[in-house]
């Protein structure tokens, strides 16, 4: 039986990003997102 293993050869870094809601609308508070490989995904 063969074992398949994916190895991309590089590590994808992620970073928490925080924005103020008032910068993108009229609400108060902070919005937390996640940047993975240079793209904000959440």
């Amino acid at each position: 039986d063969a074992e398949f293993r994916h190895d991309s050869g590089y590590e994808v870094h992620h970073q928490k990003l925080v924005f103020f809601a008032e910068d993108v609308g009229s609400n108060k508070g902070a919005i937390i997102g996640l940047m993975v490989g240079g793209v904000v995904i959440a």
């Epitope: 103020f20 993108v24 902070a30």
Partner: nanobody, 124 residues
Framework: EVKLEESGGGLVQAGGSLRLSCAVS????????MGWFRQAPGKEREFVGA????????YYADSVKGRFTISRDGAKNTVYLQMNSLKDEDTAVYYC?????????????????WGQGTQVTVSS
């Protein structure tokens, strides 16, 4: 050109308090998002906290949450960092920084205006 100037640093005993000020000149204060960073000897500059342009919202690093408070005074074009219950590990050079609206508040590269820094030393 926007200029930021910090003041209020100094030597304080552990458990004590200190208030840093950051005077902003040369720009429209209400359009600049303000933050505080710090850099301890031999370490990278780290995010401390930030305040929104209106002053209605603040956000803090976990390491200072509940002890530090950021406020801003639009009449004086000044941002404040009130530091209470100071610990040895709070010893660092503290920098105030300004960023354009819409940028992430917790990362260094969002900020394009920086003060010269003020030293805070906490002794036990």
């Amino acid at each position: 050109e926007v200029k930021l100037e910090e003041s209020g640093g100094g030597l304080v005993q552990a458990g004590g308090s200190l208030r840093l000020s950051c005077a902003v000149s040369g720009g429209t204060f209400s359009s600049i998002g303000m933050g505080w960073f710090r850099q301890a000897p031999g370490k990278e500059r780290e995010f401390v906290g930030a305040i929104s342009r209106s002053g209605d919202s603040t956000y803090y690093a976990d390491s200072v949450k509940g002890r530090f408070t950021i406020s801003r005074d639009g009449a004086k074009n000044t941002v404040y960092l009130q530091m209470n219950s100071l610990k040895d590990e709070d010893t660092a050079v503290y920098y105030c920084a300004g960023r354009p609206a819409g940028t992430a508040i917790n990362i260094r590269r969002s900020y394009n205006y920086w003060g010269q820094g003020t030293q805070v030393t906490v002794s036990s």
